[in-house]
């Protein structure tokens, strides 16, 4: 009956931690005799390529300083402890403990047995390193350039992770990588660039960073800031101001980042009316007459500029009572 | 403590057998197989085969397969072997030898001098 | 069947040399060799298995090498007890096979 090494074919483990490469002689056959087992690396230099041995009287044997006996352990063989004990040996099961990049690579697990031979099975080790990761947004403003307006950054990841973003902005992405702090590891930044505009002001943006460590993509919302001037309308004309009308008012409705820091209230015509008193965003007008017969200019300031909006205004002799139009903009 | 203890020289003419013997001790005899070696001086080291008393299976090497027959009896730990149609060719120190890790323990050898 | 050639029949060294036994297989046999001292009148007692692991209560002076098909037994600082026979064996395949020896003198 063959017998047959049972290996898997790559086995991945976190970098610092522990891993196990699962190594087992199937079936059992009665008389087959497994004299030693041996595990090594067959692509490392030649004075490092044995890894470990185990011989059922001495036990296990770790000659080589990488990764070395501190690191190194069979899981479940066992030697001959007396003349009443066999060594069990079909578990070949190799532990690697304190993960190094150095590790990574194809280990061979054989087993000697009489009177079948040799047969070996190899693993891939790969290790792995698990990102953390972080996006924040970037305090911009305003202009007619790409600027960076979030980060997102993958730190110390192996293999370096992928990182994308969702968003309906129109937006380009540039990644730079950089070795990380630990050996063999990545860092990867992704900055969301974008002319910033207050259209960006406070839209959130998701980055999505993928790595084979982890069960499903992090989804890490960000939140744009964008400095912005000010973005006005005016707001409350309903093109039925009439001669001593006096439920009117006009607002002035503001998107800004950061918050106004003034409004100020003016006719193109140069000629305010007295009837019409400024109350910050507000312009509440007392009675209307035919000095409304103007175009209102609100004009609003912020630490990053100013903003304005005009709205053209008709005085009727009488109210319309067809029924209220549309409200001006 | 594992011991190997073997039978002594033998002296015999040509064509005629021989049977040796090979009495093992301070290990569970049935889970190892036991090994026979020859040595002619000047000639290195030949494995002949091995015999495994846990269920008397043996298997040999093919160039001493119509020389030697291996045999064991769990009974009292010992394992046989015989050498047939003996001829000067035979003339050798024969070991048994437990197979361990390597062959780990070793008789002290059995001398076959096979002359007219 | 696989050949081990030990092409050195006899070797000379003087106490406190270094010497090397060498062992050719005919084919590729990993790392599956080992390697037996022999001193006259005894039974062969293992040195080094797996190429390159020493056997327990073996002097460090005793170190094997190699893989594939060239393997090799060095003795650092030989001393008189080394004055000995040595050889090389595979266990890679059914038939076992051992080299034909190399007998280390001392001068």
């Known amino acids: 009956q063959d017998v047959r090494v049972q290996v898997l074919p790559e086995v991945r483990g976190q970098l610092g931690g522990t891993v196990e490469l699962p190594c087992h002689l199937l079936p059992p056959v009665p008389g087959l005799y497994i004299s030693l087992v041996t595990w090594q690396r067959p692509d490392a230099p030649a004075n490092h390529q044995n890894v470990a041995a185990f011989h059922p009287k001495m036990g296990p044997s770790f000659p080589s300083p990488k990764p070395g006996s501190e690191r190194l352990s069979f899981v479940s063989a066992k030697q001959s402890t007396g003349q009443d004990t066999e060594a069990e040996l079909q578990d070949a099961t190799l532990a690697l403990h304190g993960l190094t990049v150095e590790d990574e690579g194809n280990y061979t697990c054989e087993f000697a047995t009489f009177p079948k031979g040799s047969v070996r099975g190899m693993t891939w080790l790969r290790v792995i390193a698990k990102p953390k990761n972080q996006a924040e947004a970037q305090k911009v403003t305003f202009s007619q350039d790409p600027t960076t307006v979030a980060l997102c950054i993958s730190k110390e990841g192996r293999p370096p992770a992928r990182i994308s973003w969702l968003s309906s902005l129109d937006w380009e992405a540039k990644e730079t990588q950089v070795s990380g702090t630990l050996a063999g590891t990545v860092t990867v930044t992704s900055r969301f660039t974008l002319v910033p505009s207050g259209r960006a002001d406070g839209v959130t943006v998701t980055c999505k960073v993928e790595h084979e460590s982890f069960e499903e993509p992090a989804l890490i919302p960000v939140t744009l800031s964008v400095r912005y001037p000010p973005e006005v309308s005016i707001s409350g004309y309903d093109d039925n101001w009439y001669l001593g009308r006096t439920d009117a008012t006009l607002s002035c409705d503001v998107r800004s980042n950061p918050e106004p820091t003034g409004y100020d209230w003016s006719t193109t015509s140069g000629t305010f009316p007295t009837s019409a008193v400024a109350q910050g965003s507000q312009l509440v007008i007392h009675a209307v007459d035919s000095l409304f017969n103007t175009t209102f200019v609100c004009t609003v300031t912020n630490a990053v500029g100013m903003g304005r909006a005009e709205q053209v205004i008709f005085v009727r002799e009488t109210p319309n009572t067809a029924g209220a139009g549309a409200t001006g903009g | 403590e594992v011991q190997l203890q073997q039978s002594g020289t033998v002296l015999t003419r040509p064509g005629a057998s021989v049977k040796m013997s090979c009495k093992a001790s301070g290990y569970i005899f049935t889970s190892y197989w036991i090994h026979w070696v020859k040595q002619r001086p000047g000639q290195g080291l030949e494995w002949i085969g091995a015999v495994y008393p846990g269920n008397s299976d043996s298997n040999y090497n093919q160039k001493f397969k119509a020389k030697a027959k291996l045999t064991a009896v769990t009974s009292t730990s010992t394992a046989y072997m015989e050498l047939s149609s003996l001829t000067s060719e035979d003339s050798a120190v024969y070991y048994c030898?437990?197979?361990?890790?390597?062959?780990?323990?070793w008789g002290q050898g059995t001398t076959l001098t096979v002359s007219s | 069947d696989i050949v081990m050639t030990q092409s050195q029949k006899f070797m000379s060294s003087s106490i406190g040399d270094r010497v090397s036994v060498t062992c050719k297989a005919s084919?590729?046999?990993?790392?599956?060799v080992v390697w037996y001292q022999q001193r006259a009148g005894q039974s062969p007692k293992t040195l080094i298995y797996?190429?390159?692991y020493r056997y327990s209560g073996v002097p460090d002076r005793f170190t094997g090498s190699g893989s594939g098909t060239d393997f090799t037994l060095t003795i650092s600082n030989v001393q008189s007890e080394d004055l000995a026979e040595y050889f090389c064996q595979q266990y890679n395949t059914n038939p076992f096979t051992f080299g034909s020896g190399t007998k280390l003198e001392i001068k």
């Open positions: 030898t437990k197979l361990v890790g390597t062959f780990d323990y």
């Open positions: 084919q590729n046999v990993g790392i599956n």
């Open positions: 797996s190429a390159s």
